[in-house]
Interface confidence: low
């Protein structure tokens, strides 16, 4: 139902849902800090533009009594309950920042007449694609899928001379929220990834994965999984791996690979890691000093959500336009704004674009090295290391099907 918005007469409020169920296990205080830091920046930017207005955030906490699993499984109704709380208190802001679970975002979008923008740090699943008033500030599954298809088809690089059309996907149901939806998208029979591949099988048991590593009758040499190196080691251990196996480890929100003193363990030599290009200023920022590397992206998305709102508010106020209109609600897309860590680009559907980085382990230095980058905005791959020191034969990625010649 319609809720009056605290969003006029020079006073603009942001409703921040502090949900018990969240895509990442992050102390709420850290998210509050990120939001508050964002508010300080927005106030400064508006003041510099000569706009004498007030911008505040209201943190809406879930009571945690009913929706208490802590992860995203019980989040479906929690978002709606919080919206009801907002409605009853008549405390809706100009924008809603918060739901990070795919389930809760989907349900909130479905069950409410959204005449205000919703900004999410998460909501990775395909079911949250193409939502007119939803903006997602962490790479959704669709972006991953497009990279994989692009990379599979690539056959004109010095280190990849075969197109691939097959894959195994390891998905055992214990994944984190981001990984769950990434792998879910790859598993879905109607997804772009499935449509473009000739063969794809989901491995659900540890033993299935372990057996494939040395199975002469395997249907593909390529295995996609999601998680960090430790997750892979738990599964793979020090088992022998056939020389033409390639494991693609999706670990987008983890910048540990770029730290100076990191050495790649031996079990990573058959692995290509897909991650995001790391930020530059985060290590010294006040809001991220307490965050582990894997959590910075989550808190940063909250902070950038505030900056995005400030950016849109500034544009609308300078143009003398009303904030509580469908035009404002639909405006949070197809733009670039100044994020905390540099420019942030949103695509036509309000999803963040980014530079994905594919890393390999150098057999010489035992360091992670950048093999290629991929710009999600233009769906294009840019090779970086033309002569990688791979573990694979002839320093080239193998064919995806053993024994098949060049195509």
């Amino acid at each position: 139902s319609q809720v009056s918005q605290n969003c006029h007469n020079g006073s603009y409020e942001i409703s921040v849902l502090m949900m018990g169920n969240s895509a990442f296990a992050e102390p709420l205080k850290n998210l509050e800090d990120a939001v508050n830091e964002g508010l300080e920046i927005v106030r400064g930017r508006l003041q510099n533009a000569g706009l004498n207005v007030t911008v505040n955030a209201t943190f809406m906490y879930s009571d945690g009594l009913i929706h208490n699993s802590g992860d995203c499984r019980s989040s479906t109704c929690e978002g709606l309950d919080l919206l009801r709380k907002i409605s009853n208190a008549q405390r809706m802001g100009c924008v809603l920042i918060g739901p990070s679970c795919t389930y809760s975002t989907f349900q909130m979008y479905l069950d409410t007449e959204l005449s205000y923008p919703m900004i999410s740090a998460g909501s990775f699943g395909l079911s949250c694609d193409y939502k007119e008033t939803l903006t997602r500030l962490m790479s959704p599954a669709r972006k991953l899928m497009y990279f994989l298809v692009n990379f599979w088809k690539t056959n004109d690089l010095p280190f990849k001379t075969y197109s691939w059309s097959t894959s195994y996907v390891y998905k055992n149901g214990t994944e984190t929220e981001d990984c769950f939806w990434y792998l879910n998208a790859l598993e879905a029979s109607v997804s772009y990834f499935s449509h473009e591949l000739g063969f794809k099988v989901v491995l659900r048991q540890d033993k299935e994965f372990q057996d494939i590593l040395m199975d002469h009758n395997r249907k593909s040499n390529v295995i996609i999984m999601c998680g960090g190196p430790e997750f892979l080691y738990k599964l793979k251990g020090d088992r022998a791996v056939a020389e033409d196996i390639v494991i693609i480890l999706v670990d987008l929100f983890n910048d540990q690979y770029f730290e100076d003193n990191v050495t790649a363990p031996d079990y990573m030599k058959n692995v290509l890691v897909l991650t995001l290009s790391p930020g530059n200023s985060l290590l010294n920022s006040s809001f991220s000093r307490n965050l582990s590397p894997t959590k910075r992206d989550f808190a940063l998305a909250y902070l950038n959500g505030i900056l995005l709102f400030g950016h849109m508010l500034k544009i609308f106020l300078e143009n003398g336009e009303n904030i509580t209109t469908p035009k404002f609600a639909h405006a949070f897309r197809n733009l670039t704004f100044e994020g905390y860590d540099g420019p942030v680009t949103l695509d036509d559907w309000g999803d963040v674009d980014s530079t994905m980085v594919l890393l390999y382990t150098s057999v010489d230095t035992k360091k992670y090295k950048v093999l290629l980058t991929y710009d999600t905005h233009v769906n294009k791959t840019y090779p970086v290391d033309m002569s990688p020191t791979f573990t694979w034969k002839n320093s080239k990625l193998p064919n995806d099907i053993t024994g098949r010649g060049p195509q």
Epitope: M19, A25, E26, K29, G70
Partner: nanobody
């Protein structure tokens, strides 16, 4: 405003015992991770014992079997019973707390972090173990 006030520190001989208390006020979160973090002279802060609102407790390896964390919800008080104290337990002990959105799992993970990321801290109480 959240306030955490520790008491119970002091000087004790090796092998002795102490009980630290932390009185919490202004803390309304239904989910939290609370506990004790210590800082020895010249060293980083480290988690000692933590308790989540679902009752999950986690201890640093160095104090397992010797320290016990407990809480009295009716008094909004957190306790740390320290037995078989050693010279290396000498440190300033801080009571720390935060709202968390996952129960025991994130609370447990904080014990492994140096300088754990809590939002609220007490002023600290000094424990000296010396003969």
């Amino acid at each position: 405003e959240v306030q955490l006030v520790e008491s119970g520190g002091g000087v004790v001989q090796p092998g002795g015992s102490l009980r630290l208390s932390c009185a919490a006020s202004g803390y309304t979160y239904s989910r939290y991770c609370m506990g004790w973090v210590r800082q020895a002279p010249g060293k980083e802060r480290e988690g000692v014992a933590l308790i989540a609102s679902d009752g999950t407790t986690t201890y640093a390896d160095s104090v397992k079997g010797r320290f016990t964390i407990s809480q009295d919800n009716s008094k909004n008080t957190l306790y740390l019973q320290m037995n078989s104290l050693r010279a290396e337990d000498t440190a300033v002990y801080y009571c720390a707390a935060d709202a968390v959105n996952w129960y025991g799992s994130i609370c447990a993970s904080m014990i492994r972090r140096k300088n754990p990321a809590f939002g609220y801290w007490g002023q600290g109480t000094l424990v000296t173990v010396s003969s």
